[in-house]
Each structure stands twice: as C-alpha cells, then as structure tokens.
C-alpha cells in the first residue's frame, strides 16, 4: 500500500465501503477520505488511537449494554483490539460491527475491516514497539500515547531539551517522568550509530539499558538491524577495545530454535567462536540458550535469556543481498558411483577414517571433503546420501586449527552457512584441531576429535549438461521446475481452494524450495498460494488433502504469527516479508494462486511410528492409544519448580522432551490421565514455545512434532509477545468452561507464560525408547 507500518490509516468497513469515525465519542460510518477525523493508529498494548479526538477505541463491558465508544487512553475500560483475519475483536471476543451506520460490538459479527487504500487487514502491519536509550528508563519501550500538558502524543517528539526524538515510557509523563531517546529505523548511521568501514557495519551500543535477550532482539529488528554477530578476531578486538561499552551485553548468539544448535540471530555463519570455558555452549541441565559477551575478555557466555542486560545492535553499511540461485535444477553428469546433483558430484565413502585420512582419500579422488553452503546442500546430504542407516555420523570438510576458533572449509570455499546440532559447536577449550561431522538423520553438525574414525563424503565439480525448456523428467509443457524427484509448476490464476491441485509440503527443504519459487511475487501486491492443507471436520485439526480424498498427517509445519487461527479453513502460503508462511483462509471465498506438484515416483510411505502396545520404561506411565510414555514432575516429587528451559533440559537429560501433541483427542486423554496423578490445581510446562526469533511469533514443539492443531487460545494477554512458553492447567471438578479441548469430564486450559516462570513439568518419550539414566 506504500504506507509505512506506523502511519495513520483509515478503517474501512469492507461490507459497505464506509470509514468509521467518532462523533461525540460514539462510532459512526462516513464516506472515506483522509481527513484527520477518520485517521487512526495502532499504539501500545494493542490499542487503536484516534488522532483527532486523542482518544482510544474501547468497550465498556461493565454495562449491561456493551458500549463501543471512545475512551481516554488511560481509562480502565477494555481498550485492546486484535484481528482474526479481517474481523476485529476486543474483550470477551466482542467483534467490531457496523449496523445502520452506527458502530457496535457483538459476538459472532462477520464484518470485514480493512486499512484504507489497501486490501490489508488492520493487523497486517501491526504496531512495533519503539525501544529507547539514554533517559531514565533503562531501554524500556515507548508508551504511546503518552500525556504531556494535556496532550496525548502518539509519536516521538523533538525538542531542544533532548538530544533526539524522545518518548515517555509510561502513560503519564507528568506524573512518572520516565523517558528515553527513541530508537527508530534510520537510513544510514547518523544519530544512534557508530560507523565502522573496516567491517562494513554500523554498531549501536546500548549501555544504560536492561532488556531480556528477546526484547533486545526486537529493539534491533525494529530499527532494521540485528543483535550483534561477531564474525572475526579483528571484529572481536574492535569491540574489546571500544571505550564506554557495557561490561557485559547481549549478542545475537542463541539456540532458541528447538532441536537446533547455536546460531546468530542475523543468520551469519557461526564459524568464528570465543566461548568462555566457564560458561560453555554445551552446559549441564541448568544451561541457557542465549549468549552475552564480556567486553574485557571478549569471551562469550551462555546465559539466561530472561536476564536484563545492555545490548549491541549491528546493521550493514549497505544492504546488498547476494541472491545465489541454489535451488535451480541443472542436469549433471558424474563418474560411475558418484551422485550427481546441481553441478556437483558426491560420493559417500563407507569405510571409517580419521578426518585427515578421509581428506587425503578425497584428494586422491580429485575431490575434497564435502563443503555445505546452503540448505539445498544439506538436503542432498539428508535425502540422497543416506537411504538406509540414517543414524550414522559422517565427516565434512569443516576444520579448525586456530585459537580463537575459526572453522574453515578444506576446499577453500567461504563459510556461508553453519548448521549446528543441539548444544553445538562445543569446542574443547584451547585444544586443536577440531573437526566436524554431521548426523545423517537431520544433517546437523557436531564438533568431534579429528582422530575419530567416521565415514565421509567427497565432493567435486560435475559436468553441467545443456538446459532444456523444461527440467529433465518433468512434463514437457512450459513452466515445470524440477526439485529432487519432484516437478513443480505455478498457476497464476486466482482460484478458490482445490481448483487446480492440492500441494503437500513435507519438509523444511521443500518449503525453502517453494519459498524460492514464490520470491518473485515479493514486490507485487501480496499474493497467496494454496496448499492442500485443510481442516475438513472443522475441529481445528489440519491434514493434507491428497488425491482421492485421502488425508495425510502433517510432518512439517510453517505457520505464520497467530496461526492456525480458526477451524474449518484451508491453508495458503503468503508472499512478501513472511514468504512461505502458512495462514488459514476461507476455502470458498478466498482466492489464491496455485503450485502444482508431480512426483516422478510414487508417494513415499508414511513414517513408521511407535505402537500403542509397546511398553513404557520403569517409572514412566501411559494411557490407552498413546504412542508416548510420560513422567510427571510435580510439587509432591520435586525439590523445586523450574523455568521452561530448565524443564526442557531436564527432560533432555532423560533422553526425553517436554510433552507434545498432534491431535486434539490426544491432549484431552493426556489431561484425563494427569488428573488421576495428583490433587488440586497445577500448571505444567509442555513443549510448546515460540522462543526462537526465526519462528516470527508462531508456535513449535520442542521435540520437532509439527503443529497441526489450533492449540493456543485467542485469550488476550497484554504481553503475549513475550509470553513465549506454554503450560497446561490440570485440575479436578473445575467450575467454568475453558477455551479449548472441552469435554464432559474436564475443562482444559492451555496458556502462554513468560518462559522464566517457575512451574512443574511433564516429560515425554516415545514408546519403545529407553530413557537415559
């Protein structure tokens, strides 16, 4: 729409094309124009602020008639609003509606609301917190609107008393006097940034602040930057020698994504390391998933993500994104025995050798140990080289001989990607050389002693064959593109669900490939592409609709923020900023483009799973039809409650994870089973979390179970964005209905919490697997 995220907008009633405005505090409809009496803006705490009246839209649900009207923004009335697709709801899930030209709020209203001049819902460009520096608020975000001299300010203000645009960090500045300099996006590196040509970056040193890792990450992101990543010894030296820098501060290093290792939040490769031996990357049960840096020593320390610390942001001097075409298919010829793939040839050598011997052997084959530069390369390793024993460990060409650690490819190519396994890279202190292997199952990397004897993969350039109009083995008509053993084609007509075909997406690699296909739609109007994912029974459970009406379970998920939002829908992928992310749409009325898929071979079998009659290990329990065994750690059997991460690591130490669920019935049965375990009310951590910034606010299970059901209730919490971990409430004979998973015997609550809350927990292990002791 050409509009900046935080610009004022008109609110258009989709059904009538009218815009809403307040008159005498009540809401009415009028013809749309951009006069100030019709301009609104999202402000803090999910409120809608009207510029002209300087008031917030709210619901007074204390009255017998639920009054929709304008309130002072410091009112105790319910002022928050959220979107569900194109409808807008507030307290008690009352939805904004227009009736006879008058604004009202009722449950179940189906009114459609859009931002003026676009097809966007009101929440498509949500409010972004503006964090602060200097002042006296320790980096807390601006509170908009804030009150000064009887005027409500909905943006940062500039005056001669402050060094830059500033805001209050509480509602009433006159009373609290809390303020800070606004950290807003800026072109270049003028006001709040220090330029460093040598590293092609600008740095922002936020010293007088105290934010959690996630808040610091959001602050940097909202300025078009990222938390600091450190990519070389020279850069580390620059930071250590910097005057006035905080003694300890957050850096972008984290392992918040479930079942993945350490990574930089800006996705730079993690091949340069400087871990503090006292706070290493692979700690014990009490370990942490975020990293801070000690400015004096330059050492990195794993630390609790909820701690409040200063932080450093970094952004590149010039945003030149190198678009390497890693997913395009090219027919390749290789010697017998070698696997051809997109211009290279690969050989998995089944004899076990030390890293050096493996390297020498590859050299003897006029090749080198494999270097991996993209997810497309990882996919080759996982899907093509390991058909049988997927659990084997295999050498790759990554090696370190330096202190501080700097991993480099043996073939001399640049490190552009790292793909570390959980708690990796775990490098022994002051001990070199260090070599890297991957585990065939997921292709994730692990640091090993170079003397270990492992299988290895050699890689060399292959002979690229001439391009044809369509990729080899794909249908001859225009537009089919090959990926692995599958062909894909985009159909650009916008149609209802299921008109052209039902696309299934089975892995992260396939999703990345599809994202690449859809990238060219970034700049145009926001387009969507249908998948074959649908909730046929309207029970909130999504399955793949495949040929012949068969349903296939979800094996991978890639939901957008607050999705899946509603039952009974069909799923489309968005383009633009959140390319490939899944969103629930109306199957009949919504229209999207299609991507069709043809397998060159038959559809693979569904993965073998444990059987319900497999026994549970001693001390673990289960219930009929469950494929898992559970161990509950509640107040009657534990010394202390734990935060989410401590609980998850506790489970991992047992070879388990916090509980996960694929089906609505499963969680019901699980909670029936739990109510027999103890009395009273208990909140128990489960594996559901949205801790990783990569998730962009969507939920995931810590054991990699894909999300296929509507799990999180749309119950409003002011600080939902930082409630990143979920727990279930278990209790006997409750007195009121919960949000989800309702049946006669129990009422079940599932709720997001701040991850540092101390709760009880429940571990889960698949039936048939032996736990660690």
């Amino acid at each position: 729409s050409g509009r900046a995220a935080n610009d004022p907008f008109t609110i258009v009633h989709g059904n009538t094309g009218k815009c809403i405005k307040p008159v005498y505090g009540w809401i009415v409809a009028d013809d749309c124009d951009e006069t100030e009496d019709k301009l609104w803006k999202w402000v803090s705490q999910h409120r809608l602020f009207h510029l002209h009246s300087q008031k917030c839209l709210g619901l007074d649900i204390t009255k017998s008639v639920n009054e929709l009207r304008m309130f002072s923004c410091d009112s105790s009335a319910m002022l928050w609003w959220k979107c569900e697709h194109h409808s807008l709801y507030g307290a008690a899930r009352y939805r904004l509606a227009l009736k006879d030209g008058h604004g009202t709020a009722i449950s179940n209203a189906s009114d459609v609301w859009k931002k003026g001049g676009s097809e966007e819902s009101l929440c498509d460009q949500p409010y972004h917190e503006i964090y602060t520096r200097d002042g006296n608020s320790y980096g807390r975000p601006c509170e908009f609107p804030f009150l000064i001299d009887g005027t409500w300010h909905h943006d940062c203000i500039l005056d001669e008393d402050h060094s830059g645009p500033w805001c209050a960090t509480t509602l009433n500045y006159e009373y609290d006097r809390k303020w800070g300099i606004c950290l807003k996006p800026e072109n270049g590196c003028e006001d709040n940034w220090e330029k460093n040509e040598q590293f092609g970056s600008c740095y922002q040193f936020n010293t007088q602040t105290a934010l959690s890792w996630k808040e610091a990450y959001v602050s940097c992101q909202n300025q078009g930057a990222d938390l600091l990543s450190i990519n070389s010894a020279a850069e580390l030296t620059y930071l250590k020698e910097k005057e006035g820098i905080a003694k300890i501060f957050w850096i972008g290093l984290n392992q918040l994504y479930s079942a993945r290792g350490w990574e930089w939040s800006d996705h730079k490769p993690l091949n340069f390391l400087n871990w503090d031996p006292d706070r290493p990357s692979a700690p014990t049960i009490g370990g942490s998933s975020c990293a801070r840096m000690d400015a004096e020593s330059g050492l990195w320390q794993s630390f609790s993500c909820e701690a409040q610390l200063p932080y450093v942001c970094r952004k590149p001097l010039n945003n030149t994104v190198e678009l390497t075409d890693v997913w395009t298919y090219s027919d390749t010829r290789c010697d017998a025995g070698w696997l051809p793939n997109n211009g290279f040839c690969y050989l998995l050598v089944n004899e076990s050798n030390s890293w050096d011997k493996a390297h020498a052997k590859c050299k003897a084959f006029s090749s080198d140990l494999i270097s991996i530069h993209s997810l497309a390369d990882v996919e080759v390793v996982v899907t093509k080289l390991h058909n049988e024993d997927i659990k084997e460990e295999v050498w790759i060409g990554l090696k370190n001989i330096n202190i501080p650690t700097l991993f480099q490819w043996s073939d001399g190519t640049e490190v552009t990607l790292t793909y570390w396994d959980e708690n990796e890279p775990n490098v022994p202190y002051n001990k070199t050389p260090n070599c890297v292997s991957y585990l065939g199952e997921l292709g994730q990397w692990k640091v090993q002693s170079c003397e270990e004897k492992l299988k290895y993969v050699c890689k060399r350039k292959g002979e690229k064959l001439n391009d044809a109009s369509s990729d080899k083995m794909c249908p001859p008509d225009e537009g089919w593109k090959r990926h692995g053993e599958t062909c894909y084609k985009i159909y650009e007509d916008e149609v209802p669900f299921g008109t052209n075909c039902n696309l299934t997406i089975t892995s992260r690699f396939e999703q990345e490939y599809l994202n690449d296909l859809m990238k060219k739609y970034d700049k145009s109007l926001r387009k969507y592409f249908w998948t074959g994912l649908r909730d046929v029974d309207s029970c909130g459970e999504y399955n793949w609709a495949t040929v012949g009406g068969r349903r296939r379970a979800v094996t991978f998920s890639n939901w957008n923020f607050l999705e899946p939002a509603s039952p009974g829908g069909c799923v489309a992928m968005s383009t633009g900023k959140s390319v490939g992310k899944w969103e629930v749409k109306d199957c009949r009325s919504f229209k999207a483009l299609s991507i069709c898929k043809k397998m060159s071979g038959p559809l693979g079998p569904e993965e073998a799973s444990p059987k319900p009659d497999d026994p549970c290990p001693e001390g673990w329990q289960s219930f009929p039809a469950s494929l898992s065994c559970y161990k509950v750690f509640h107040a009657e059997r534990i010394v202390r409650k734990r935060n989410w991460e401590e609980a998850e690591r506790f489970c991992q130490a047992l070879g388990a994870h916090l509980s996960s669920f694929s089906h609505v019935d499963e969680i019901k049965e699980f909670l029936h089973f739990l109510t027999d375990q103890f009395s009273g009310q208990h909140w128990l951590w489960i594996g559901l979390n949205k801790r990783s910034p990569d998730l962009q606010g969507s939920w995931q299970w810590s054991d990699r179970t894909p999300v296929s059901t509507i799990i999180m209730p749309n119950e409003f919490q002011q600080d939902y964005d930082i409630r990143d971990c979920a727990a279930v409430k278990v209790f006997h004979r409750p007195w009121r209905r919960g949000w989800h998973f309702y049946d006669d015997r129990e009422f079940i609550y599932l709720r997001p919490f701040a991850c540092d809350t101390k709760l009880e927990w429940v571990c889960q292990i698949p039936k048939g697997r032996t736990p660690k002791t």
Epitope: Y24, W26, V28, A29, D30, K99, D100, G101, H102, S107
Partner: antibody, heavy 115, light 107 residues
Framework: QVQLVESGGGVVQPGRSLRLSCAAS????????MHWVRQAPGKGLEWVAV????????YYADSVKGRFTISRDNSKNTLYLQMNSLRAEDTAVYYC????????WGQGTLVTVSS | DIQMTQSPSSLSASVGDRVTITCRAS??????LAWYQQKPEKAPKSLIY???SLQSGVPSRFSGSGSGTDFTLTISSLQPEDFATYYC?????????FGQGTKLEIK
Amino acid sequence: QVQLVESGGGVVQPGRSLRLSCAASGFIFSIYGMHWVRQAPGKGLEWVAVIWYDGSNKYYADSVKGRFTISRDNSKNTLYLQMNSLRAEDTAVYYCARAPHFDYWGQGTLVTVSS
Amino acid sequence: DIQMTQSPSSLSASVGDRVTITCRASQGISSWLAWYQQKPEKAPKSLIYAASSLQSGVPSRFSGSGSGTDFTLTISSLQPEDFATYYCQQYNSYPYTFGQGTKLEIK
C-alpha cells in the same frame, strides 16, 4: 431519559398523503440511525424503513418502496416519514425506534387509510 | 428476503415455569437477532439484542442464545408480568424481518 414521541397519524383516504414525525430527546440524536416499524391491527410487526445518523443512507421495505420517504432534521432532533399514495393495507400503528439495536421505541401513532 | 419462523405460535404456562421460544432464520444472520415483548395496546419492548445481550433494565430471568440460523429465548422462571406476545427479528440485512410472534398465556 430516552424518549421517542410519534405524531401526525390520523384517518386519510386512499391515494392521499400523510407525514409522520418522531421527536427524540434524552440522547444525541445526530449520531444514531432511526427506524420506522408498523403493526396492522391484530397482526405482527413489520419493518418499514431506516435512515442513517446523517441521512446519507436510506433503506425501505419492498411494500412501501417508491411511496414512502424517510428523512430527518438533526437540528430539530426529529425523524419523519412522508407517506404518499396511501393504501388500505398501510393502516397500522407506526412506531419509530432507535438504531442499531431497536433499544428504544415510541408509543406509536395510528394511521387509518379508509374511504 | 430472510424469513423468520417462530415456534410455538402460542403456549400456555404457569408462574415459575421455565419457558423456551425458538426462532429460525431462512439463512445465516450471524448474531443479528433481537427479541421483543409486547403487551396489548403497548409498544414493543426490547429484551435481547445481538442474540444474547440483555438490554439495560431487563430482568436477568430473560436470556437469549444461538447464532447463524437457530435462536432461543428462555425465561427461567415465569412471573405474572411476563404474559405477553414475543417477537424475534433479524437485523442482519435489509429488509429487516420479524417472526410472526409467540403468544404466552397463563395456564
């Protein structure tokens, strides 16, 4: 308190005209839509017409379309119903009611169309 | 036009009884349904709006439920002043339409 008072009813011959008024008090008239609803003797309720708060939009029941006109004067806090080409079947008690939820009704005014 | 069908068209009940009147729309009307009480020679009085919201000043023994096409008005314990005719009305789309009415009489 909210009050709606209809007036202007009476006996009229078929084909003639009549203008009903509804005087509003106790609320901000200029921000509410208003309805006319009628009830024939011994029969149920029938919705007649609506006008938005600013007079910009008007809607009618098919049975009165082209014959009746709803209007308002926000400066006088008054709603009107101009009824032309009256028919015997228009005989009813006419009520005004406040939009959007029909929360307040007037006491009604009787219109009798008879020769 | 949307047709509104009320049932029953009349019913007899005693003071203290629990009474239910139903209303069915010929197509989905979301929650845009109102219930009115009318006594002889009086204007209708609004009881329920938006299917389930109680109008200000209406006793809590009156309640409404439903969404889409099927709606219910319930009087939990009949009082002498509740004997009257009850109408439902859809105001989802023009022209707004009423049910034919349910006459509630003393048994």
